[in-house]
């Protein structure tokens, strides 16, 4: 038994036929010693007398509000809730399994940007006697603050004969660092109480993995002379992180008729305009995705082809900041080749994702995961890799990136990746390894020496451990190279001489 909040207690029960239940001792919160009686809920039947009441809790009939009285006066209440465990698994009767992205997904969360603000939602078919409370933190062993509002009913839907209710909550990380590479996941805990049943649900994620931008805004069409082509332009959504030269998006532009089965024109671009073929009854749709990290695509923003009227040109991706401030104190006193670094880091992003696409069936955040990922270098808040830090002095950040590149390059060449089980012959790990080396050499030409971090002894003994470690390292590398790519893109746009 444990206290959920003042005067509310949760009794944890193994739930099987003829289970003995739990013995619970309730104590009346009063200085009085005698003449005390106990009742349950609205019943006037006296269950016992004295300052304490011992009960055997086996089923929901034993739960409820226990009240102690003296001479017609209520002294205190204790509400007992039951938390069922069947076959070693806690019950999940209150919320509906959303089955996306995998089974047993009860909470789903999304973030529109990297500000540390996110929304979580869940579904239930229960309409009454239902309360939720939400807590969140970053990390679990030394948690950092995340503030969540109250859960509210956000939608009602009819699904066949049933009504389905969607609840949502907004949370904000107290000290968010949008440019940093997250090393500890956000933990979200939802307590759900339906009548006398208690359940808890948890979700663990990095903001980067739940990013879903808002759709692009201000779609405009401009027909091109003597052609069936039109130029479509758009802008970054207002809710996306700035500056856009650092937090860049990539876009998918699609022209299609009303039916999904109809033929289409489709093109991908990093710019905020594209030229497509527009048929009479079709519409043009554009959606956005983080350019350097493969999180969710936005919903589509659409405009009918027939409305090719207004012709404002495509607006640029804004927020590039001031012109070419000189880089200080890079080894040898020279600036890195920002544009070359940008191209190679973007290639690294692509390779890191093709080496390890999102593994839907494998939950890589298992026990001890905080320790494993702490062994690899992360680009942290104080490393100067944010746009302001880069403008002030990019050397700190470049040094940090260089350390990370060397670290991952050594890891990819180590026994973890060369040992059994052998990598598939078509694995891009070899290319990834070479590209990491290439970028580190661009950053630090021969003869200059920055300190490099020691490679920890991550030597797994079993092939399955090696496999798991590969997944974890590649997932971590994806996050690292995404931040590096943002740094170089921003540098190329704003710091290049």
């Amino acid at each position: 038994i444990w206290e959920l909040k003042k005067d509310v207690y949760v009794v944890e029960l193994d739930w099987y036929p003829d289970a003995p239940g739990e013995m619970v001792v309730l104590t009346c919160d009063t200085p009085e010693e005698d003449g005390i009686t106990w009742t349950l809920d609205q019943s006037s039947e006296v269950l016992g007398s004295g300052k304490t009441l011992t009960i055997q809790v086996k089923e929901f009939g034993d739960a409820g509000q226990y009240t102690c009285h003296k001479g017609g006066e209520v002294l205190s209440h204790s509400l007992l809730l039951l938390h069922k465990k069947e076959d070693g698994i806690w019950s999940t009767d209150i919320l509906k399994d959303q089955k996306e992205p995998k089974n047993k997904t009860f909470l789903r969360c999304e973030a529109k940007n990297y500000s540390g603000r996110f929304t979580c939602w869940w579904l239930t078919t229960i309409s009454t006697d239902l309360t939720f409370s939400v807590k969140s933190s970053r990390g679990s062993s030394d948690p950092q603050g995340v503030t969540c509002g109250a859960a509210t009913l956000s939608a009602e839907r009819v699904r066949g004969d049933n009504k389905e209710y969607e609840y949502s909550v907004e949370c904000q990380e107290d000290s968010a660092c949008p440019a940093a590479e997250e090393s500890l996941p956000i933990e979200v805990m939802v307590d759900a109480v339906h009548k006398l049943k208690y359940e808890n649900y948890t979700s663990s994620f990095f903001i980067r993995d739940i990013i879903k931008p808002d759709p692009p805004k201000n779609l405009q069409l401009k027909p091109l002379k003597n052609s069936r082509q039109v130029e479509v332009s758009w802008e970054y959504p207002d809710t996306w992180s700035t500056p856009h030269s650092y937090f860049s998006l990539t876009f998918c532009v699609q022209v299609q008729g009303k039916s999904k089965r109809e033929k289409k024109d489709r093109v991908f671009t990093d710019k905020t305009s594209a030229t497509v073929i527009c048929a009479k009854n079709a519409s043009i749709s554009v959606r956005a995705q983080d350019r350097y990290y493969s999180s969710s695509w936005s919903e589509w923003a659409s405009v009918p082809c027939s409305g090719s009227g207004s012709s404002r040109g495509g607006s640029g991706s804004g927020g590039s900041g001031g012109g070419g401030s000189k880089l200080r104190a890079v080894p040898g006193g020279s600036s890195p080749a920002w544009t070359q670094c940008q191209q190679l880091s973007q290639k690294l992003c692509t390779l890191a994702w093709s080496a390890h696409p999102l593994v839907g069936h494998m939950d890589l955040r298992e026990e001890g995961d905080e320790e494993t990922t702490n062994d690899v270098p992360h680009i942290q808040c104080g490393d100067g890799c944010d746009p302001q830090g880069l403008r002030d002095n990019s050397q700190f950040c470049l040094q940090r990136i260089h350390q990370g590149l060397i670290f991952y390059e050594k890891l990819l060449g180590s026994d973890i990746f060369t040992g059994e089980p052998s990598l598939l012959p078509d694995s891009p790990v070899g290319q990834l390894h070479a590209s990491l080396l290439g970028l580190s050499q661009l950053l630090q030409p021969e003869g200059h020496h920055w300190e490099t971090q020691q490679i920890p002894s991550l030597s797994p003994s079993q092939p399955w451990q090696r496999l798991l470690l590969r997944f974890k390292i590649l997932r971590s590398l994806q996050a690292f190279v995404a931040v590096a790519a943002r740094v170089f893109a921003h540098g190329a746009a704003t710091l290049s001489p």
């Epitope: 033929k263 289409k264 024109d265 489709r266 692509t350």
Partner: antibody, heavy 118, light 107 residues
Framework: QVQLVQSGAEVKKPGASVKVSCKAS????????LHWVRQAPGQGLEWMGW????????EYAPKFQGRVTMTTDTSTSTAYMELRSLRSDDTAVYYC???????????WGQGTMVTVSS | EIVMTQSPATLSVSPGERATLSCRAS??????LHWYQQKPGQAPRLLIY???QSISGIPARFSGSGSGTEFTLTISSLQSEDFAVYYC?????????FGGGTKVEIK
Amino acid sequence: QVQLVQSGAEVKKPGASVKVSCKASGYTFTDYYLHWVRQAPGQGLEWMGWIDPENGDTEYAPKFQGRVTMTTDTSTSTAYMELRSLRSDDTAVYYCNANKELRYFDVWGQGTMVTVSS
Amino acid sequence: EIVMTQSPATLSVSPGERATLSCRASQSISINLHWYQQKPGQAPRLLIYFASQSISGIPARFSGSGSGTEFTLTISSLQSEDFAVYYCQQSNSFPLTFGGGTKVEIK
């Protein structure tokens, strides 16, 4: 399954015209874009243009503009490509191909060899 | 127009070995890049679309990667039926253009 069958080989004199046909089957003709791509002997591939059989819309590569005409006959599910003012360097295998997506080529015809020689 | 350059022009590989084919665009084309295989006397066939998307029915040993201006087609372990000419094609803008091709021949 989707299939494209092209007309037979042609030999033409310089200055003449050629009209190659491409008969589609295994799908609703108007549901796919149709492209024409050619390949000179021992050379690479060269895109000529596309047609949308649903409405007759076309887009030609600038190199062929004014010299090529692409048409379709929906009643027979057949596409045609006519190339005029033939020169010896038009000697090539001409392929038709079809796809629901406009910008790449999924299903190819077997090709039609057109030889331009005096 | 966008110029596509493939390298090498000819690649000599032993059966069972890995082959890596490169394609470079004259300007950034995002992931609007497709790969085809052509055997002598046959029409080309689509292998990979949008840089890395695989086609059903195409063996898993064919994989594509890249974005921007540099792209790679990898054949992990060459089989006898893979000796052919491979073309890349950009779909970023019209006119659609192909690379000059890479001939993969038996070493």
